[in-house]
Amino acid sequence: ELCDDDPPEIPHATFKAMAYKEGTMLNCECKRGFRRIKSGSLYMLCTGNSSHSSWDNQCQCTSSATRNTTKQVTPQPEEQKERKTTEMQSPMQPVDQASLPGHCREPPPWENEATERIYHFVVGQMVYYQCVQGYRALHRGPAESVCKMTHGKTRWTQPQLICTGEMETSQFPGEEKPQASPEGRPESETSCLVTTTDFQIQTEMAATMETSIFTTEYQ
């Protein structure tokens, strides 16, 4: 199930998704003056099995005399079959890469891609927030947002993060550097069944970064 909206914006914060759930789609967009190659894929798709996930398809841009006017698309499930698999791993990736089962890493850059990457997230996707330079974090809880299915509709949880200027006094003393635990998110929700696959980010990842990666169109 695709998430309808983009993750929430927090003032003076930026977010990233450190990994993408299987089913995530990334539009193959090119920068101005370039277009997708004629036989090229419209999107990349995170696919895999329990032990290994990777991006199907490869985005390729070529020089264009005329502007690329193709619309951004959200492919339908039936369009997703019989696509060529291409490993999008850099040959020089260090071996200590963090990886999550059922998730793909950020695809490496491709030549002349658009500045913004347009992702189509699926339910269970998590993004991580961090205050930008010059601001510090005041936490009430996890600095993350998860796309959840509630009452048949998708929504992003609200990250429990406030970013304040360096000189401003802390509203939450002692809560400047908490360990964001993925469990027990404070959420004011009416009790109903929430269908989501909340994945737990590896402790090392969660501890080192209260961060994020991309949203459907996040730059």
Epitope: K31, Q97, A114, T208, S212, I213
Partner: nanobody, 130 residues
Framework: QLQLVESGGGLVQAGGSLRLSCAAS????????IGWFRQASGKEREGVSY????????FYADSVKGRFIISSDNAKNTVDLQMNSLKPDDAAVYYC???????????????????????WGKGTLVTVSS
């Protein structure tokens, strides 16, 4: 696939200077943080410096602050690292790397970690003799 190619490494005396360059032909600079890691023999790879390709903001590891200067030429698709007052401790293989920016084109230094880069160069060796 797009590649990062480093150059400029070599042997230099302590106190001397070197200028490393990373060529990233075809990279859309304003979507990435681009910069440098280094790995000395028997040690972990560590972040040295990066520049935000969108807004030009920079980061330096404490160990190189005031001695190293990172700059980019978006038209030429290159990122340079000017290394001054080199010390024997600076000797290492220097790797160019890129990482996607976060939302709103922002980037934070805690993301500049070895496991999380999107693409790596093959490295260039810097030797500093005392």
């Amino acid at each position: 696939q797009l590649q990062l190619v480093e150059s400029g490494g070599g042997l230099v005396q302590a106190g001397g200077s070197l200028r490393l360059s990373c060529a990233a032909s075809g990279l859309t600079f304003d979507g990435y943080a681009i910069g440098w890691f280094r790995q000395a023999s028997g040690k972990e790879r560590e972040g040295v410096s990066y520049i935000n390709g969108r807004d030009g903001s920079t980061f330096y590891a404490d160990s190189v602050k005031g001695r190293f200067i990172i700059s980019s030429d978006n038209a030429k698709n290159t990122v340079d690292l000017q290394m001054n007052s080199l010390k024997p401790d600076d000797a290492a293989v220097y790797y160019c790397a890129v990482d996607r920016l976060g939302s709103r084109g922002a980037y934070v230094s805690t993301w500049w970690r070895s496991p999380d880069m999107d693409l790596w160069g093959k490295g260039t060796l810097v030797t500093v003799s005392s």
